[in-house]
């Protein structure tokens, strides 16, 4: 006899990153004919919705106006049918963006690079902190960490045209406060270049484009819950 | 066209410090790393380290860490390499080079240290 | 940090000869390799970036090539202003490391 329900999938829209005194949703999903939602956050009760009618709705949101570091953190959410209640979901990481300062981000040899040469991103934030994320930008939001004093290193290997992309970095200064992002370096990566002598490091887009990464994450988001359940558990872990 | 001025020529007395520097032109500088490579003389080449104008990132190779210091001046387009404590083991031809994959070389500077 | 090993460390050859360099990485630098030309008087030029691209301006005698971690240059033809000191450079990992020199002398 099943003793509990399927686990949910959580998420946030419109990203689990969140620029603080901006407004995000959680989101939960689970079966319908669930009574009863339950938000935990740090491992406490946060939130609970009772959907009506619970026979027609299998999602719920947890509105938040107003980010700021006491709500960034580690989410999950169960649901309950009758007497029965789920497994809990996967943790979300919501993390809090926009805090203190604003990384630089350089690319090693250069933002224009041949199939197979090998890459290092450099994240500089001169202010205390000692943890650095690197992210790529897509639907699954790639994410590497690394550490230093006033900046980090990300070696990527050698290349391929899947390295190709925009990239950003954040200074965190902890798991789920972080800085502003830096300026994005957009990653060329070509099997031949006529000549990549002093190809340009700078943008080749403005900065208020990370609007449109939000946009843009959220799309693929809703296309695929479970990947992205699955990335922001592991985000920061 | 791309050019890196350095000073033919820097005398210095053991124990003091030198500050050498690199002019570039032709190119938008805060955009490229600027690497620093020494040269012994009848010897072969090695990397000091490098920097990013823009960012202010920094590499250097740890051999070098505790003798130079890389920095920039934006204003001027102007790369530096302090040298420390010096002794004649410092003497050598130091050439700055332009782009992340050292596309463009300094003339290079010979430094001699000399009481 | 990479060692590169070059050889042969000097060459005599002779005007319209075929010669090849060559470096060996220690470790894995994928495709991050130039050569440099050095004149005596010390002037530096890249010649070859990314193990097998031309730069700009430099005569199609040259060329660059890679078989697993070996790393070669090949002047096709020598002519007398190719006979100078040449260096491979690995940027793929900090330190970057040059090779010891080529000294390509004329017989």
């Known amino acids: 006899q099943q003793q509990t329900l399927p686990k949910p999938f959580i998420w946030a829209e419109p990203h689990f990153m969140v620029p603080k005194e901006k407004q995000v949703t959680i989101c939960c999903q689970g079966n319908y004919g669930a009574v009863e939602y339950q938000l935990h956050f740090e491992g406490s009760l946060f939130a609970v919705d009772r959907p009506k009618p619970p026979e027609r709705i299998n999602k719920v949101q947890f509105y938040i106006p107003d980010m700021n570091s006491r709500m960034a953190g580690q989410y999950s959410c169960i649901y309950r049918v009758g007497e029965l209640w789920s497994e809990p979901s996967n943790l979300l990481d919501l993390v809090v963006t926009e805090m203190y300062d604003t990384p630089t981000l350089s690319v090693h040899p250069g933002p224009e690079v041949i199939s197979g040469e090998k890459v290092t991103f450099y994240c500089r934030l001169d202010t205390a902190t000692s943890m650095f994320l690197l992210l790529k930008e897509g639907r699954s939001s790639h994410v590497q960490r690394g550490y230093g004093k006033v900046q980090a290193e990300f070696p990527l290997g050698p290349v391929t045209t899947a390295h190709r992309g925009t990239y950003r970095c954040f200074g965190s200064y902890n798991n789920h406060a972080w800085s502003f992002p830096s300026e994005p370096v957009k990653l060329l990566v070509t099997g031949d270049i006529e000549n990549t002598s002093l190809a340009p490091e700078d943008p080749t887009f403005p900065a208020d484009t990370w609007g449109t990464y939000l946009l843009t994450t959220e799309t693929g988001l809703q296309k695929d819950h479970a990947l992205w359940d699955h990335t922001a558990q592991n985000l920061l872990r | 066209q791309v050019q890196l001025q350095q000073p033919g020529a820097e005398l210095v007395k053991p124990g003091a410090s030198v500050k050498l520097s690199c002019k570039a032109s032709?190119?938008?500088?805060?955009?490229?790393?600027m690497h620093w490579v020494k040269q012994r003389p009848g010897q072969g080449l090695e990397w000091i380290g490098m920097?990013?104008?823009?960012?202010?990132?920094?590499n250097y190779n740890e051999k070098f860490k505790s003798k130079a210091t890389l920095t920039v001046d934006k204003s001027s387009s102007t790369a530096y390499m302090q040298l420390s404590s010096l002794t004649s083991e410092d003497s050598a031809v130091y050439y700055c080079?332009?782009?992340?994959?050292?596309?463009?070389w300094g003339q290079g500077t010979t430094l001699t240290v000399s009481s | 940090d990479i060692q590169m090993t070059q050889s042969p460390s000097s060459l005599s050859a002779s005007l319209g000869e075929r010669v090849s360099l060559t470096c060996r990485a220690s470790?894995?630098?994928?495709?991050?390799l130039n050569w440099l030309q050095q004149e005596p008087d010390g002037t530096i030029k890249r010649l070859i970036y990314?193990?097998?691209s031309l730069d700009s301006g430099v005569p199609k005698r040259f060329s660059g090539s890679r078989s697993g971690s070996d790393y070669s240059l090949t002047i096709s033809s020598l002519e007398s202003e190719d006979f100078v000191d040449y260096y491979c450079?690995?940027?793929?990992?900090?330190?970057?490391?040059f090779g010891s020199g080529t000294k390509l002398e004329i017989k």
């Open positions: 990314a193990t097998s």
């Open positions: 450079l690995q940027y793929a990992s900090s330190p970057f490391t």
């Open positions: 470790q894995d630098i994928g495709s991050s």
């Open positions: 080079a332009g782009g992340g994959r050292l596309d463009y």
């Open positions: 032709g190119f938008t500088f805060t955009n490229y790393w």
């Open positions: 920097i990013h104008p823009n960012s202010g990132s920094t």
